[in-house]
């Protein structure tokens, strides 16, 4: 059971966290583009992991970490001080209807993106589901062409909200279908900014 | 080339910028409703252009520009100082399935809304894709009524994220289907607010 | 990270996350409300439960957020809808889902839509389905303004703290 969240193919959010939080570094130095040294903030962009995983990049393209914000593959995004944070996430998905036609129900897929909190003052126990979004997609098939895959479909699942975090707590993204993530530029990201 | 974005009817994001950034003025005076003179911020609301284009309104209804933020049809939204900005966009879309039935693939449309950066310290070259959302819609038809258009469908494509911008850089929205934009109040907007 | 699940009720008792005691100088007007899961056929906003809160002047009255001071606010809201497929023989009409954040102000004699999303769902074509709507934007608000929501498809809401929420914070 997924901690009161939406149904997902990934029953164990912790397991997905291990898979989905790879590919990163703790910033030993701030990126040169850091224009706001006083503000804990981060914007991480989705990057594929080998084996159909979702990882996060902290330095390429628009990604950055500021003011002691840290990210590691195993532990997620750690904010450096207590405060009120606006957390946000967008995951782009893409796919095709499988070949063979059949009834639409068998083709439906429910895509889910969720943001969890773990560790710190919250304790080492079960991750806590903070925010999540979902979308059910039913890809179409050409009835006349029952052999091949259907056309590409795209969707995005995003959300954002205020969360009070303590230093040492970590936030991370869990997704239901890492094999369907769209890693094209600008499509998949998550981040945080301290607002109070 | 669309910089990693989805295929769009507008192959050249710069050209779409010209089309999609109309309907504006540079604010010679700040709107009287500017309640936060120290904070660069803007909220622009979608407004139709002649010829099925998407323009942006800077003063009507809830739209505003503050603290030296400027908007022009040709160049987009210019932020007055270096900093960390939360950029956001939501585009509502609406349409009907075309008459005549046919296969579902032919009815599918992938709606895309994208936010680009250009100019300033980033350089005068190719616009840079910052954030993007997408949604594939397959309108349904009433099988018993093959003559007329299908029922209205609605969807929204939105996103928001942190971007480090420098003074003189400009951000603008590019969309794939300006003819399908829903201009009802609250449906289509983009904006920026400096958070650090 | 451990992945042991909790039932929602157990989760609520296990997750009493203490309120922040931030230095007063850093406090800004802010609010994050969640849909009351005990009210299944209406959308009632709750504060002071789970991760919901009202901070530095925000108040909740008649299911509306009252803006404490004039300024620019980032306002956001999300809903998640769900439903079951109808039987294959049933001719299901499309289901209209919508969610809107509205402003009621002394400057306007009516509710003004600030953020609005809508969607048509065709349940007959699908298995159990989920659809989320999130939107957020910056607005210039005046002290005393009221922010409220209007939702079509309330019986289909997935009322949990992570899925249905409404908030604002001063910038």
């Amino acid at each position: 059971q997924d901690q009161g969240g939406l149904v997902t193919e990934t029953a164990d959010p912790g397991a997905q966290a291990q898979q989905g939080l790879g590919f990163q570094k703790l910033p030993e130095e701030e990126p040169e583009t850091d224009l706001s040294p006083g503000l804990p903030a981060a914007h991480l962009i989705g990057a594929p992991l080998k084996g159909q995983g979702l990882g996060w990049e902290t330095t390429k393209e628009q990604a950055f970490l500021t003011s002691g914000t840290q990210f590691s593959d195993a532990e997620g995004l750690a904010l450096p001080q207590d405060g009120l944070y606006y957390l946000y996430c967008l995951v782009g998905y893409r796919g095709r209807a499988p070949p063979g036609g059949g009834d639409p129900q068998g083709r439906s897929v429910t895509l889910r993106s969720s943001l969890y909190r773990a560790g710190g003052a919250y304790g080492p126990g079960t991750p806590e589901l903070l925010l999540e979004g979902a979308e059910t997609v039913t890809p179409v098939l050409d009835p006349a062409r029952r052999q091949g895959y259907g056309p590409l479909w795209y969707t995005s699942v995003g959300f954002g909200g205020l969360v009070q975090l303590r230093r040492g707590e970590r936030v991370y993204v869990n997704i239901s279908h890492p094999d369907m993530v769209d890693f094209a530029r600008g499509k998949t990201f998550f981040g945080a900014v301290m607002v109070g | 080339q669309d910089q990693g974005g989805l295929v769009t009817e507008t192959a050249d994001p710069g050209a779409q910028a010209q089309q999609g950034l109309g309907f504006q003025k540079l604010p010679e005076e700040e709107p009287e409703t500017d309640l936060s003179p120290g904070l660069p911020a803007a909220h622009l609301i979608g407004a139709p252009l002649k010829g099925q284009g998407l323009g942006w309104e800077t003063t009507k209804e809830q739209a505003f520009l503050t603290s030296g933020t400027q908007f022009s049809d040709a160049e987009g939204l210019a932020l007055p100082q270096d900093g960390l900005y939360y950029l956001y966009c939501l585009v509502g879309y609406r349409g009907r399935a075309p008459p005549g039935g046919g296969d579902p693939q032919g009815r599918s449309v992938t709606l895309r809304s994208s936010l680009y950066r250009a100019g300033g310290a980033y350089g005068p070259g190719t616009p840079e894709l910052l954030l993007e959302g997408a949604e594939t819609v397959t309108p349904v038809l009433d099988p018993a009524r093959r003559q007329g258009y299908g029922p209205l469908w609605y969807t929204s494509v939105g996103f928001g994220g942190l971007v480090q911008l420098r003074r003189g850089e400009r951000v603008y929205v590019n969309i794939s289907h300006p003819d399908m934009v829903d201009f009802a109040r609250g449906k289509t907007f983009f904006g920026a607010v400096m958070v650090g | 990270l451990p992945g042991v699940g909790l039932t929602p009720s157990a989760a609520q008792t296990a997750r009493q996350h203490p309120k922040m005691h931030l230095a007063h100088s850093t406090l800004k007007p802010a609010a994050h409300l969640i849909g009351d899961p005990s009210k299944q056929n209406s959308l009632l906003w709750r504060a002071n439960t789970d991760r919901a809160f009202l901070q530095d002047g925000f108040s909740l009255s008649n299911n509306s957020l009252l803006v404490p001071t004039s300024g620019i606010y980032f306002v956001y809201s999300q809903v998640v809808f769900s439903g079951k497929a109808y039987s294959p023989k049933a001719t299901s009409s499309p289901l209209y889902l919508a969610h809107e954040v509205q402003l009621f102000s002394s400057q306007y004699p009516f509710h003004v839509p600030l953020l609005s999303s809508q969607k048509m769902v065709y349940p007959g074509l699908q298995e159990p389905w989920l659809h989320s709507m999130y939107h957020g934007a910056a607005f210039q608000l005046t002290q005393g303004d009221q922010l409220s929501t209007h939702t079509d498809g309330i019986p289909h809401l997935v009322l949990s703290p992570s899925t249905v929420f409404f908030g604002a914070f001063a910038l």
Epitope: G22, F23, Q24, K25, L26, E28, E29, A47, P48, L49, K50, G55, E57, K60, S72, D73, G92, R94, V181, D182, F183, A184, R185, K187 | Q1, Q3, G4 | -
Partner: antibody, heavy 118, light 111 residues
């Protein structure tokens, strides 16, 4: 800044084992990315030999069969190449590199020249 | 293994002119909506240096004279205008499937 530096013997006898070390500074090899060995033959052809992942898993080029092993010492922030049963065809310049997968190999060592000769 | 075929093997271009290098893959290197194709520049005695990642994205610090394009199996590196400092060998590399493979290289000279 992230830096990689190869070290090891420049001359190895045929049938013996080649052992090289890559020392990484400015970044923890257990925090992320994939840590590769690439070699360049005298005719300038480049060959990916294999990598060790941030999580310790390995992948090797099948052309090297069972001759190759890539390991790491997390405490020293180093990873290692061992190539058994070398022949003259294994001569060349050996590079270690950080691989960001979809972002390419963004940091390389300067390379170390290896000659297999009796 | 995915075979990458570069052409031409060598190229002589006048200063200020455009240089175009092609790389063809034996099978598609696209996945997850992106192309796992990268371009490197190597000067004598130095390691390869990343220029372009994901087929068309300029690596940080690389001049905008370099650009990349293509998808699936056909990719192009363009240098425009060519400068003296560009004399080097250029390689394409795919990371979509293990083992990683490189093209045979294109040597750029100034006319």
């Amino acid at each position: 800044d992230v830096q990689l530096q190869e070290s090891g013997p420049g001359l190895v006898k045929p049938s013996q084992s080649l052992s090289l070390t890559c020392s990484v500074t400015g970044y923890s090899i257990t925090s992320g990315y994939y840590w590769n060995w690439i070699r360049q033959f005298p005719g300038n052809k480049l060959e990916g030999m294999g990598y060790i992942s941030y999580d310790g898993s390995n992948n090797y080029n099948p052309s090297l069969k069972n001759r190759i092993s890539i390991t790491r010492d997390s405490s020293k922030n180093q990873f290692f190449l061992k190539l058994n049963s070398v022949t003259a065809e294994d001569s060349g310049t050996y590079y270690c590199a950080r691989d960001a997968y979809s972002y390419g190999m963004d940091y390389w060592g300067q390379g170390t020249s290896v000659t297999v000769s009796s | 293994d995915i075979v990458l075929t570069q052409s031409p093997a060598s190229l002589a271009v006048s200063l200020g002119q455009r240089a175009t290098i092609s790389c063809r893959a034996s099978e598609s290197v696209d996945n997850y909506g992106i192309s796992f194709m990268h371009w490197y520049q190597q000067k004598p005695g130095q390691p390869p240096k990343l220029l372009i990642y994901r087929a068309s994205n300029l690596e940080s610090g690389i001049p905008a004279r370099f650009s990349g394009s293509g998808s699936r199996t056909d990719f192009t590196l363009t240098i425009n205008p060519v400068e003296t400092d560009d004399v080097a060998t250029f390689y394409c590399q795919q990371s979509n499937k293990d083992p990683y493979t490189f093209g045979g290289g294109t040597k750029l000279e100034i006319k």
